[in-house]
């Protein structure tokens, strides 16, 4: 089942995607949709990403992270009810059927109407190891038959070490940003 | 306008191969997933086979794999499906279908017959 | 493989009254759902989309809703020539895989 993120009306909303290229410069194209992952593709593509560079995005949404290093988490601008839902990160790699594909649950709450002043906490520098090549379940590390000189390490999400963890209770619980890569 | 039209259809025995042809035009078929989809007489719809815009990557349902080859001419605005080791069950009537996922557009289908 | 189960397989109706259409899959599908409209002796027609986005040329009396495992395609008041078979396809899981139709006739 998909992990559930949160935001508030009006903030930026994080989707964390990762994976590790082989090499600097050997991208793997990704889209990404609104909706679920369907058996092909992205459907209602939002953005998309080639073996170089962003090739195509809508207004409101980017890659605030270095993509070239395997960052494709999605960054929602100044979010809405209406974007609450399901996207899909799909990691496009050469072959038959090899796509990762992740579903990522939005929920977005209501603004606070006067907001208590919770300190961001940069979920980096408090998880420095966020972007080791650690597999967990369905993020195991893939070498791809079809393409040798590349291995793939699809890291989905963070929260897998941090579902049970009181630590993302307390970040949960105090408002703040989970940047869960 | 967008049209597919299909062709090479045709009465053949167990064993045998065909070879259908699917013409497009009304749009820029070199931008689109293809698909082919055949619905056995008096019968519901099967996903056969589809491939990608640059012929990359190509899918087949399991019945037709090592059997069914699909390919692509973007110069020609076509689409192609062999068939070989044609069996009795393979008889329908053969759609090309523009999309990867769901199907926009059909031709309006040839018939490929398989007995003895 | 994704069972896609179409009820009824024959729905009699008459002409101005409402028809609602039932699909199930087996598994769960998310929104990622389409309907057909085929005619005798036609191909079929794309008519929804993503559970409930109707597709060009067909008018607001057909709407889709569901997710999941449960989709119903409405056609709120039937014309003459909304009498056809209807088929819903998933296309969540691998194969991509189309239920077998609801045939609504003219009651």
């Known amino acids: 089942s998909e992990v559930e993120y949160r935001a508030e009306v009006g903030q930026n909303a994080y989707l964390p995607c990762f994976y590790t290229p082989a090499a600097p410069g050997n991208l793997v194209p990704v889209c990404w949709g609104k909706g679920a992952c369907p058996v092909f593709e992205c459907g209602n593509v939002v953005l998309r990403t080639d073996e170089r560079d962003v090739n195509y995005w809508t207004s409101r949404y980017w890659l605030n992270g270095d993509f070239r290093k395997g960052d494709v988490s999605l960054t929602i601008e100044n979010v809405t009810l209406a974007d609450s839902g399901i996207y899909c990160c799909r990691i496009q790699i050469p072959g038959i059927m090899n796509d990762e594909k992740f579903n990522l649950k939005l929920v977005i709450k209501p603004a606070k109407v006067t907001p208590a002043p919770t300190r961001q906490r940069d979920f980096t520098a408090a998880f420095p190891r966020m972007l080791t090549t650690r597999g967990h379940g369905p993020a195991e590390t893939q070498t791809l038959g079809s393409l040798p000189d590349i291995n793939l390490t699809q890291i989905s999400t963070l929260a897998n070490e941090l579902r049970d963890s009181r630590l993302a209770n307390d970040l949960r619980d105090s408002g703040a940003t989970i940047r869960i890569g | 306008e967008v049209q597919l039209v299909e062709s090479g259809g045709d009465l053949v025995q167990p064993g045998g191969s065909l070879r259908l042809s699917c013409a497009a035009s009304g749009f820029t078929f070199s931008t689109y997933w293809m698909t082919w989809v055949r619905q056995a007489p008096g019968r519901g719809l099967e996903w056969v086979a589809n491939i990608k815009q640059d012929g990359s990557a190509k899918y087949y349902v399991d019945s037709v794999k090592g059997r069914f080859t699909l390919s692509r001419d973007d110069a020609k605005n076509s689409l192609y499906l062999q068939m070989n080791s044609l069996r009795a069950e393979d008889t329908a009537v053969y759609y090309c279908?523009?999309?990867?996922?769901?199907?926009?557009?059909w031709g309006q289908g040839t018939l490929v017959t398989v007995s003895s | 493989e994704t069972v896609m189960t179409q009820s009824p397989a024959t729905l009699s109706v008459s002409p101005g009254e409402r028809a609602t259409l039932s699909c199930r899959a087996n598994q769960n599908v998310y929104s990622n759902l389409a309907w057909y409209q085929q005619k005798p002796g036609q191909a079929p027609r794309l008519l929804i989309y993503d559970a409930s986005t109707r597709a060009t040329g067909f008018p607001a009396r057909f709407s889709g809703s569901g997710s999941g495992t449960e989709f119903t395609l409405t056609i709120s008041s039937l014309q003459s020539e909304d009498f056809a078979v209807y088929y819903c396809?998933?296309?969540?899981?691998?194969?991509?895989?189309f239920g077998g139709g609801t045939k609504v006739e003219i009651k």
């Open positions: 396809q998933q296309y969540n899981n691998w194969p991509l895989t």
């Open positions: 279908a523009r999309g990867s996922n769901w199907f926009d557009y």
